[in-house]
């Protein structure tokens, strides 16, 4: 959805939900060319990019949340995989760089899109939960209560280690919208039923 | 009334150091991540340099980026900026400025009216 | 990084008359539906004052004679009326990556 605007139609709400993050638990939209930009697309490099535990909800704790609980928690894990998602842009090779050691300049632009991708999932969360009269959840265009604040590794000089941690990360992010897929594909046909 | 107020700039050497302060008053500081942008004299506008709101996450400008420090005191609603290895090209009016909008897309919609800083020997 | 270029550098308009300044991106400054552009005026001696956010809102404040367009790579900020009050200098941001850069400015004065 473009800035601001909040469609009032539950089930057309809950389509894009569900197609936005179908798209974004698809490993190669971001963790794959995140790993092949990196240098990481090693199978013993490969092995060390693994979750971190507790860097996001898992689906359990999403499932016991309730609609309104659940929205807010994603709204404000989206705002901080904002954050990382700008942290590792910082860090990415320059289009330069990469088309001179022979990368596909197609994996870069792919990791420019999550962001803003994200951002309109997490729009399309607001509206949702405006939809579900939730009026404790920031407007996404205002500044909020403060994102708040998450397992942040701790800043690394080290290189390769921060490429782990960013790898470790994606593939986290992944899994988690995998999980928030499968909480919205059991809500029900309208606002006030859930298929639990 | 919003406001942001620079100090600690002045005259420093190539090679010196510099700390900038920003003082905010008007706004709940800790809601809102901020920013250094820059004016050298007679020229435009370069951001250099933003935190989050809670400090956790930073971003800079390529030119800046290891001898420059953004950080931020919540709880005394203040903005700094640790300046390191100062060279002639960083003189230039730094402004602080408030961050609005959506998180990492920013804009500034509130800005200080500046503290210059001069690199020269 | 992208590059901001900002056009004309001046631009004299008698006063009443529509003033147009445009900005163009080295790439797109667009996605997902949101155009990450931002428009900035400057007095002399003054600190910058945003006029136009996310390429057509308008800040709160500012006189509606003041309006945004564009998507992609172009975008336009539009004085339908200019008023003598609006002498001063221009500057479109990006914040679609970092870094945020601003174009190189447009000085708009009276004819």
């Known amino acids: 959805a473009a800035m601001g605007s909040c469609s009032k139609e539950y089930r057309m709400l809950l389509g894009q939900l569900q197609k936005q993050t179908d798209l974004m638990q698809d490993t190669s939209r971001l963790l794959d060319p995140y790993i092949r930009i990196q240098g990481l697309d090693i199978p013993k490099l490969r092995e060390h990019c693994r979750e971190s535990p507790g860097a996001f909800p898992s689906e359990e704790t999403l499932r016991g949340l309730g609609r309104r609980g659940f929205l807010q928690t994603l709204n404000a894990t989206l705002g901080r995989v904002l954050h990382r998602l700008a942290d590792l842009e910082q860090h990415l090779p320059k289009a330069q760089d990469l088309e001179r050691s022979g990368l596909n300049i197609e994996d870069l632009e792919k990791l420019q899109m999550a962001r803003p991708n994200v951002l309109g999932l997490r729009n399309n969360v607001y509206c949702m939960a405006q939809l579900l009269d939730n009026s404790d959840m920031t407007e996404p265009t205002k500044a909020g209560r403060g994102t708040p604040q998450p397992p942040t590794p701790t800043p690394t000089s080290d290189v390769f280690q921060r490429k782990l941690e960013g790898c470790s990360f994606l593939r986290g992010y992944h899994r988690f919208m995998h999980s928030v897929g499968r909480v919205f594909s059991k809500w029900g046909e309208s606002p006030n039923r859930s298929r639990r | 009334e919003v406001q942001l107020v620079e100090s600690g700039g002045g005259l420093v050497q190539p090679g010196g150091s510099l700390r900038l302060s920003c003082a905010a008053s008007?706004?709940?500081?800790?809601?809102?991540?901020m920013s250094w942008v820059r004016q050298a004299p007679g020229k435009g506008l370069e951001w250099v340099a933003t935190?989050?709101?809670?400090?956790?996450?930073?971003y800079y400008l390529d030119n800046v980026r290891g001898r420059f420090t953004i950080s931020r005191d919540n709880a005394k609603n203040s903005l700094y900026l640790q300046m390191n290895s100062l060279r002639a090209e960083d003189t230039a009016v730094y402004y602080c400025?408030?961050?609005?909008?959506?998180?990492?897309?920013?804009?500034?919609?509130?800005w200080g009216s500046g503290t210059l800083v001069t690199v020269s020997s | 990084d992208i590059v901001m270029t900002q056009s004309p550098d001046s631009l004299a308009v008698s006063l009443g008359e529509r003033a147009t300044i445009n900005c163009r991106a080295s790439?797109?400054?667009?996605?997902?539906?949101?155009?990450?552009m931002h428009w900035y005026q400057q007095k002399p001696g003054q600190p910058p004052k945003v006029l136009i956010y996310?390429?057509?809102n308008l800040e709160s404040g500012v006189p509606d004679r003041f309006s945004g367009s564009g998507s992609g790579t172009d975008f336009t900020l539009t004085i339908s009326s200019l008023q003598a009050e609006d002498v001063a200098v221009y500057y479109c941001?990006?914040?679609?990556?970092?870094?945020?850069?601003f174009g190189g400015g447009t000085k708009v004065e009276i004819k």
């Open positions: 400025a408030r961050d609005v909008g959506h998180t990492t897309f920013w804009y500034f919609d509130v």
């Open positions: 008007g706004f709940t500081f800790s809601n809102y991540a």
């Open positions: 935190i989050s709101d809670g400090g956790s996450f930073t």
């Open positions: 790439k797109s400054v667009s996605a997902a539906g949101y155009n990450f």
């Open positions: 996310y390429a057509s």
């Open positions: 941001l990006h914040s679609r990556e970092f870094p945020f850069t």
